[in-house]
Each structure stands twice: as structure tokens, then as C-alpha cells.
Amino acid sequence: HSDGIFTDSYSRYRKQMAVKKYLAAVLGKRYKQRVKNK
């Protein structure tokens, strides 16, 4: 099934969204810290 329809599952999508959310939070935090330090 490496080239089948089951390669794009909702559980996989949710994990990707969670990672994106986490990265956005971390990068946002870093950006705010940089601005603060200036």
C-alpha cells in the first residue's frame, strides 16, 4: 500500500498539524524573545 489510498490518513494528518502547531509556538516564542532583546 505504499502507493495506495491509505497513505493519507486522518491520524497522520493530525500528527502533522500538531507538529506544525508546536513549531509555530516555538518559533513565535523565539521571535518574541529576539524582539524583546533588541
Epitope: 502507493d3 489510498i5 491509505f6 493519507d8 490518513s9 486522518y10 494528518y13
Partner: antibody, heavy 113, light 109 residues
């Protein structure tokens, strides 16, 4: 992340028609996309899927009657080769493999002489 | 293609009541790829449950999916007026095809 269908209109039987699905917030290079239709007052009917590589899968009744293809990283098409009045329906595109977690609002196709 | 038989085609219950919808497949679904959808008139379907028993994001815990293999059930408890809709099951199969059930109209009295 969202999807939207376009291209639905009134056509006469036998006139080919192409519907387009435009996605935003993700790329078709990493998604499985589907076409699902619903005749007025009827249930949902899966037409087929296109996976990230471009490989397509169809319901047996749809094979030869419909062609799904990717036209860019954000658009895919459904070609109705020779529509009949039985193809009158709202056509939805939806993301997901075997389960459909992002749906468009649908586009109405009316086939009538 | 596999056939997904959904029963009943219509059911009704009072606010606060319980509704049970069944889906039977003519062959086993692939790796529990059975999902449930809610559809209201003029709207696209709304994704409720995936892989037979998992709630999609934002779906109330009043919705419960169960089953495996060829037999699946959607149970809605503590019915609300807003639950009035048509519900569909869909199964994914190892042949890389998908089949929908015929739908169940839920009327809330």
C-alpha cells in the same frame, strides 16, 4: 486547509465536462484526493481517488466514464467523458485516504437535453 | 465492488434519547478504515469518526463508533435537536476502493 470545486454547469448528454478542485493550505504532492458525488435526494457515491504519485483508483461503475488527473500542486480535475442524465449530481472533492476529512462545498452538474 | 449496507434508512428519537445506526460490509474493511459522516441539507458531509471508533477533532463524545471487520455501529446518546441529519458510513478496502452506506436519516422529536 480547504478545498473548493468549480466548473459545474448545465450540459447536454454526451458533452464532455471537466470539474476542477483547488486546494489551499496543503499540496497535492503529499495528499490523497477524492471525487464523491450525490444525486439530488440520494446518498453519497465515491467516484475515485488520486494519490500523491498520481496513481488513480476508481469505483468499478466509474471506470472509463470519469478521468481524474492532477494539473498542478494545488489543482486536480475530474473529466466526465460522456455524461448522461444519470450523472446529474453535486460533485464534491475531499481529502483523505479511505476516510474523507476535508470536504469542499460541492459543485452542481445538471445533464439535460 | 464491496457493498456497504446501512440500517435503518430512517430513525427517530426524542431529545435526550439514543440512536443506533448499523453498517454491514460485504467484505472486511482494510485495517479498520471505517468512517462516519453527518450531513445536513445543502451542506457537504461533516467528518465524525475515523478508523471505526476514533472521534474527529471537535466532535462531541456523545457520538460513539464501534465494531470491526464487517460489522460497525454508530451510537448517538443524549440526542440534541442539532443532531437531526443524515448519517453515512464509508469503508476503505484493500483493493484501494471506498464504499459508502446508503445513509440513515435521524429525526429528533
Amino acid at each position: 486547509q480547504s478545498v473548493e470545486e468549480s466548473g459545474g454547469r448545465l450540459v447536454t448528454p454526451g458533452t464532455p465536462l471537466t470539474l476542477t478542485c483547488t486546494v489551499s493550505g496543503f499540496s497535492l504532492s503529499s495528499a490523497v484526493m477524492n471525487w464523491v458525488r450525490q444525486a439530488p435526494g440520494k446518498g453519497l457515491e465515491w467516484i475515485g481517488s488520486i494519490v500523491a504519485s498520481g496513481t488513480t483508483y476508481y469505483a468499478s461503475w466509474a471506470n472509463g466514464r470519469f478521468t481524474i488527473s492532477k494539473t498542478s500542486s494545488t489543482t486536480m480535475d475530474l473529466k466526465m467523458t460522456s455524461p448522461t442524465t444519470e450523472d446529474t449530481a453535486t460533485y464534491f472533492c475531499a481529502r483523505g485516504g479511505g476516510e474523507f476529512f476535508i470536504w469542499g462545498p460541492g459543485t452542481l452538474v445538471t445533464v439535460s437535453s | 465492488d464491496p457493498v456497504m449496507t446501512q440500517t435503518p434508512s430512517s430513525t427517530s428519537a426524542a431529545v435526550g434519547g439514543t440512536v443506533t445506526i448499523s453498517c454491514q460490509s460485504s467484505e472486511s474493511v482494510y485495517s479498520n478504515y471505517l468512517s462516519w459522516y453527518q450531513q445536513k441539507p445543502g451542506q457537504p458531509p461533516n467528518f465524525l469518526i475515523y478508523q471505526a471508533s476514533n472521534l474527529a477533532s471537535g466532535v462531541p463524545s456523545r457520538f460513539k463508533g464501534s465494531g470491526s471487520g464487517t460489522q460497525f455501529t454508530l451510537t448517538i446518546t443524549d440526542l440534541e435537536c442539532d443532531d437531526a441529519a443524515t448519517y453515512y458510513c464509508a469503508g476503505g478496502y484493500s483493493e484501494n476502493i471506498v464504499g459508502f452506506g446508503g445513509g440513515t436519516e435521524v429525526v429528533v422529536k
